[in-house]
């Protein structure tokens, strides 16, 4: 398909900024215009572009769960970033959803990591020192978690 | 995960309408935009439409422009293809496409899912 080829149309939207192409790519913050003379900038709170680009679209900007914060909102050249709340996580298997920490670990073993936004309480045998496989146990002890602090992006597109 | 399945495909006569459609399941589209694509049988598949997440900015291949026009209702996670004046250069297989944008040029950018494409016979 030649560049040629495409032939954008536009319906009447806000005045948006534009400025040139260099090379045929647009700087972050823009995705390129219907004849590919144009940059138009990304609308602000809605959708973004990271890179320099020949996009005809820029991305949409991700919203938050419910059960997340936002830390940093979407702006033109970078997306949401969003973060469980305190005392749940997301795992990199199943980033979709955040899931509640544990409240502690159970008959014979002791917590050696708080509940973070990325990880859930970390459990080790008493004696060896392994660690325990994640799955929720029959019995709890008392032994409660703290939620930790530190930023982790919101790795989905939506 | 994001599943596109794709309807309205027939034969039609020269000159007459059909209206695609692909409807999503799975994870909701209307953060992806969305485009239509088409292979006609020894041919590699082209770029057709496609139209941005919130349905506002539409771009189509040269061949198609003013006959054919692409629309979205996210409510309904479905994407459409209303194609009128139909030609014989028009019979392909047409594939629905949902990407996080799409390049100059027409290719996928970022995340992208397809259906299994609907037959258009013209």
């Known amino acids: 398909i030649t560049q040629q080829d495409l032939a954008p149309q536009q319906r009447a939207a806000p005045q948006q900024k534009r400025s040139s192409p260099s090379e045929g790519l647009c700087p972050p913050g823009h995705h390129i215009s219907e004849d590919g003379r144009d940059c138009i900038s990304c609308k602000y709170g809605q959708d973004y572009s990271t890179h320099w680009n020949d996009l005809l679209f820029c991305l949409r900007c991700t919203r938050c769960d419910s059960g997340e914060v936002e830390l940093s909102p979407c702006t033109t050249t970078r997306n949401t970033v969003c973060q469980c709340e305190e005392g749940t996580f997301r795992e990199e298997d199943s980033p979709e959803m955040c899931r509640k920490c544990r409240t502690g670990c159970p008959r014979g073993m002791v917590k050696v990591g708080d509940c973070t936004p990325w990880s859930d309480i970390e459990c080790v045998h008493k004696e060896s020192g392994t660690k325990h496989s994640g799955e929720v146990p029959a019995v709890e002890e008392t032994v409660t978690s703290s939620p930790g602090t530190p930023a982790s992006p919101c790795s989905l597109s939506g | 995960e994001v599943q596109l399945l794709e309807s309205g495909g027939g034969e039609v006569q020269p000159g007459g309408s059909l209206r695609l459609s692909c409807a999503a399941s799975?994870?909701?589209?209307?953060?992806?935009?969305m485009g239509w694509f088409r292979q006609a049988p020894g041919k590699d598949r082209e770029f057709v439409s496609a139209l941005n997440w919130g349905g506002d900015t539409t771009y189509y291949a040269e061949s198609v422009k003013g006959r054919f026009t692409i629309s979205r209702d996210n409510a309904k996670n479905t994407l459409y293809l209303q194609m009128s004046s139909l030609r014989a250069e028009d019979t392909a297989v047409y594939y629905c496409a949902a990407a996080q944008s799409f390049r100059r040029g027409g290719a996928p950018y970022g995340d992208n899912y397809w259906g299994q494409g609907t037959l258009v016979t013209v």
């Open positions: 799975g994870r909701t589209v209307s953060n992806y935009a």
